[in-house]
Interface confidence: low
């Protein structure tokens, strides 16, 4: 057995996520390092990974989730300090949440869960409230994004995936307008012809008349 020295900190009702970065690489993750979209199993699939003796039971740029996540991960994981004004309050997960056995030299908590700062156990995220898309040791789930007024929800927030928001029809967001949806152009300038309709992530595309023929 290993020896354990645990600091005796007073439990706080507000949880900070400076506990560390979300692990985006292995463990339900592909080769190191990978992007946000990890290839690992679902939280449900990994929920059975309770360690014990043998006797025991044996992406598209128009989706705001991509850009938002980059900032959420950096902001939440590196800047938030427990007890600071920026801390995240974890929603009460005492009812109906599943816990996995934790060991001091254990694995990361699976996607869809987070590390309990008090017990060290993995607590499941609350569906529609928080998520973790990769194995992690965060002290709280990342909060689900609420789509802005100029956006629509492409897919709802699950325990393992953030809300995917996209611009409403007739508007778009590209790399130049990451924070707001812009109205699509109504038509092409004189001498140009439309070859591509507006999408939530790009404006209409126009080409010079002579090269555009036959592309409609």
């Amino acid at each position: 057995a290993s020896g354990t020295e645990a600091a005796t900190a007073t439990p706080s009702k507000v949880w900070g996520s400076s506990a560390g970065r979300i692990e985006l690489r292995g463990g339900g993750r592909g080769a190191l390092p990978t992007s946000m979209g990890q290839q690992g199993p679902s939280a449900q699939a990994r929920a059975g990974r309770v360690v014990g003796p043998r006797s025991a039971q044996g992406a598209s740029p128009g989706l705001r989730v991509h850009k938002t996540l980059k900032f959420v991960v950096v902001g939440v994981l590196l800047q938030v300090v427990p007890g600071s004004a920026a801390t995240i309050k974890v929603h009460d997960q005492s009812v109906g949440t599943q816990q996995w056995e934790h060991s001091p030299l254990g694995e990361l908590c699976p996607p869809g869960s987070h590390r309990s700062e008090h017990s060290g156990a993995c607590n499941q995220c609350t569906e529609g409230v928080g998520y973790t898309s990769a194995s992690n040791n965060l002290f709280s789930c990342l909060p689900c994004t609420a789509c802005k007024s100029d956006e629509e929800e492409r897919s709802a927030c699950t325990r393992t995936r953030n809300t995917a928001c996209q611009c409403k029809p007739g508007t778009f967001r590209n790399d130049d307008s990451a924070e707001m949806c812009r109205k699509c152009s109504t038509g092409c300038p004189r001498g140009k012809v439309k070859v591509k309709d507006c999408t939530p992530w790009s404006d209409i595309e126009c080409v010079h008349n002579e090269s555009g023929n036959g592309h409609n």
Partner: antibody, heavy 121, light 118 residues
């Protein structure tokens, strides 16, 4: 580039003390768990101690419990191993290793070159 | 009896494929463990190679080529490290480790010395 550089090794008499240091660079030290692993001459790897990202949780192998103390100074990007009541069997190359997570796992993704500790009279 | 058992030595010819074994003591179930593999060349520190839990849940170490791959045999309670297209630089000691248990007395296996025959 991730770098871990151990120092503080040397020759010490049985019962003596030594403090090993590990200087970390090339990553955000304060967000990773860290370990000390040793290797006696011609032998295999033996995990010695581990500490989580904040220093709040420390873990030791039975063989060193009560004699060794692991600590870290995140402001200085440094990991330490205070070794007291040293024995001949503590003679080994001591490696500093980074855990891939904030807590402690068996996934030690980067290792230092090691520092040799010799306990002999 | 150690928690993890590795054969002390194995050898194979240049360019061939070899499979190293790490057997978990039978009072534990490898089905719930990840298997970790480390390589240590003479005079060098250990290097993390890979972690294997299942085909869909695995990770490769930094700059570790796909010639190195992991697998498990739950029925035999074993983890494997396969090395294909053996090269001279693969001659090294290979250690396995498994997670996660609260007991950390035996984190690493005893190691297998791999010899590459030319």
């Amino acid at each position: 580039e991730v770098q871990l550089v151990e120092s503080g090794g040397g020759l010490v008499k049985p019962g003596g003390s030594l403090r090993l240091s590990c200087a970390a660079s090339g990553f955000t030290f304060s967000t990773y768990g860290m370990h000390w692993v040793r290797q006696a001459p011609g032998k295999g790897l033996e995990w010695v101690a581990g500490i989580n990202y904040s220093g709040n949780n420390k873990y030791y192998a039975d063989s060193v419990k009560g004699r060794f103390t692991i600590s870290r100074d995140n402001a200085k990007n440094s990991l330490y191993l205070q070794m007291n009541s040293l024995r001949a069997e503590d003679t080994a190359v001591y490696y500093c290793a980074r855990d891939h997570s904030t807590w402690l796992s068996r996934h030690l993704d980067y290792w230092g070159q090691g520092t040799l500790v010799t306990v002999s009279s | 009896q150690p928690v993890l058992h590795q054969p002390p030595a194995m050898s194979s010819a240049l360019g061939t494929t070899i499979r190293l074994t790490c057997t978990l003591r039978n009072d534990h179930d490898i089905g719930v463990y990840s298997v970790y593999w480390y390589q240590q060349r003479p005079g060098h520190p250990p290097r993390f190679l890979l972690r294997y839990f299942s085909q869909s849940d695995k990770s490769q170490g930094p700059q570790v080529p796909p010639r190195f791959s992991g697998s498990k045999d739950v029925a035999r309670n074993r983890g494997y490290l396969s090395i294909s297209e053996l090269q001279p630089e693969d001659e090294a000691m290979y250690y396995c480790a498994m997670g996660a248990r609260s007991s950390v007395t035996h984190v690493f296996g005893s190691g297998t010395q791999l010899t590459v025959l030319s």
